[in-house]
Every structure is written in C-alpha cells, then in structure tokens.
Amino acid sequence: PLATIPVSTTSLTSSEGSTISTPSVDISTPVTTSIVGDQCSRCKNGGFWDGLKCQCLTPYYGESCEEVVNSIDIAPPETVSAQMELTVTVTSVKFTDELKNHSSQEFREFNKTFTEQMNIVYSGIPEYVGVNITNLRLGSVVVEHDVLLRTKYTPEYKTALDNATEVVKQKITKVTTEQIMTNDNCSALMCFNTTGTQVQNITVTQYDPVEECRQKAEEYEDYFLVEYRDQKPYCISPCESGFNASKNCNHGKCQMSQNGARCLCVTTETHWYSGEDCNQGTQKSHHHHHH
C-alpha cells in the first residue's frame, strides 16, 4: 500500500522555481553518530563516517544516508551449472587393484578412454562440459562419475539444465543398451552392462534474483521487485523509471519510505497538485497587488 502525503509539509523550491512538498517528519531509522577526530557526522541507517563523508549501506544513499536508492545492483552468475552423479558398469575392461589408485598408469588410461567415450555419447548436448570419475570398483569396472553441465544464466536456466539432464539420461541409457559385449568381445570403444546404469543424484546451481533483491533491500524488501531487461534481472523500487512496475508521479517526485513508494506533489505558480499520483491539478486564484 502506498502512503498518502503527510498533512504537515514543508515547501522546498525546486530548480524550476516551483515548490515540492516534502514530509516534515523524519521517516528514517534512529540516528547513528560517529566521530572521527573532531569531525562529527550524522550518518543514518547504519552508515559510517570515513573522515570525509558518510559511507552508506545498501539500500541507502545521500549526505546522511537518509535516502533510499531506486535500484539495487544484483549480480547473477555469468554461468550456472548442474552436476549429475552417475554409475555405469564397463564390461570391456577387467578390474585390477591399480585402478583404485588415481595416479596409476592404469587409472590414467581408463580415464582417457572413458572420457573419450562419454564425449562421444554427449556430443550433441550444448550444456555438456565433461565427466569426472570419482571412484572405480570391482564388477567388471563399476564407474562412479559426475557429468558436468553448464549454461549461461538466463531467467529460464533451470529449465535448460533440467532438459539437459534428461537428455544425458536418455543418451547414457541408449549407449549402455547398445554397446554390449558379444562372445566376450567388444567392438566399440567401450562396452557396458545395461543393468548397471544408474543416476544417483542431480545438483543444480541455485540462484534466485528475487531472494537476492529482497535481502539487499532489507526493511524495504516488500517494495523492491525484480524485473528483466534483455534477460538480465534488475532489483528496482517503483521509483525507478522505465520499468513495468515504475510509479508515474506525473506532477511530482517519487520517494521511498518504509511504507512504500509515494508521490510528493509539486506546487507551481499556477497550480497545486494532489492525489496519490499527483495527477489532480487545482488552479490557484490570482490576487493582484497594486503598489
């Protein structure tokens, strides 16, 4: 809900020669005073004096950190990722104890062949980054490994990664069904036991711009919201112009308070403006003074 203009107002002369009605009550939180040397500064809302000026905390700005910004920087990651924990059973290689040692020549050769095979399997998936073997164990060789996926951050990144994980499942199921041993021989790069293929776990990057926006807005969290422009999220208050949620104050100035965004209406030489959006103009009556 938007606050109405306080009854008690102070008229300030604007740069255009008109006046702006501003609240005479202090809507900010209690004053914090910090002293450096013999310089005393009133830095409000948790701001601190650095010897020259107030250093304000988000979402405040101004000489005394008394004003609320119209937009807050939020920085989604450039890329987002998913990690799939998979198990496959390779039948074309027999297990030896040396495979347990990740620095052995056996492990390095197995890793090379397995990586080549998986790169072929997942070659059509744009989000595919690679595989990482986490453990090898007996049976012929049970391969516990991670499939790594990555994509550029967009608002739909979760859908993109979810789709990619589904394609990974389809492709690994297909290859482990088709590339199987015949008479104890494998004619493919690797052969598999069809029943040994399992997806253990899927972890997807969690990033919520709305959550970051609300956290940074602190006590104004209910009044800041996220809007997208060119797939980039912006954390804005209704006082930020140019967005769908922007508040149109017509003949006035938008200002944030702890009750939300409100319009402070101007008074010109000819009109008073009022209303929630400063769109109701009342013409002043003219009194002529003779000298």
Partner: nanobody
Framework: EVQLVESGGGVVQPGGSLRLSCAAS????????WGWFRQAPGKEREAVAL???????FYADSVKGRFTISRDNSKNTLYLQMNSLRAEDTAVYYC?????????????????WGQGTMVTVSS
C-alpha cells in the same frame, strides 16, 4: 614412456609364413593387454589377434587357425606367427598395448602403438 618396435615384416608368397616380433620397453609386460592390428590400403585398422594378462585371446575370423599370438615375458616381446598367408593378408601390421586388461577390438581403446611393419603377400 612405453615404446613398441615391430620387426619381421617382408614379402612372402601365398601359402608362406612369417613371424612378427614386437619388442616393448617402459612397461610391465606381464600385465595388461597386447595385440596385433593391421591396416590395408584404403581400409580401417582392424584387430587381428589380441591377448590379455588374464588369459583372454581374440582372433579375427579371417585368421583363425592360421595365425597364433604369443608373448615371452622374460624378453618383453610379443609375437605373431603367420602361416598359410594369403594375398588379402597384405597390410601394415601394428603392435599395440595397454596397461588395462581389455576385451575390446576397437583400436581407439588401445593407447600404445608401434610404427608398423609391412607384410606383402604376392606371387
């Protein structure tokens, strides 16, 4: 570093015999897998005879009963005894090795290769 050096190739008449050798170094010869592959002009490399440390052996259908793979661990050497040679056996023969105990005929799964020795069967 693993090094494989083949020898024993040459020109032989149909029905004749040859014995190929592959000397290995930088490798524990008693473990892993060893094999002979061949590549005829304009064709893909194919598995001829393979052997693994656990006793597994493979022979291509076209050489069964004519070729024999063996190894001498004390000499770190792999052999291919080729009898009753035919014109279609003409190819470059490659020795291959892996520290893994393999069951695969696919050359891409084999990591170490010799430079090859030419076998020509011609009258």
């Amino acid at each position: 570093e693993v090094q494989l050096v083949e020898s024993g190739g040459g020109v032989v008449q149909p029905g004749g015999s040859l014995r190929l050798s592959c000397a290995a170094s930088g490798f524990t010869f008693s473990r892993g897998s060893w094999g002979w592959f061949r590549q005829a002009p304009g064709k893909e490399r194919e598995a001829v005879a393979l052997i693994s440390s656990d006793g597994w052996t493979f022979y291509a259908d076209s050489v069964k009963g004519r070729f024999t793979i063996s190894r001498d661990n004390s000499k770190n050497t792999l052999y291919l005894q080729m009898n009753s040679l035919r014109a279609e056996d003409t190819a470059v023969y490659y020795c291959a090795a892996s520290v893994l105990v393999l069951r695969t005929l696919n050359p891409k799964a084999w990591h170490h290769w010799g430079q090859g020795t030419m076998v020509t069967v011609s009258s």
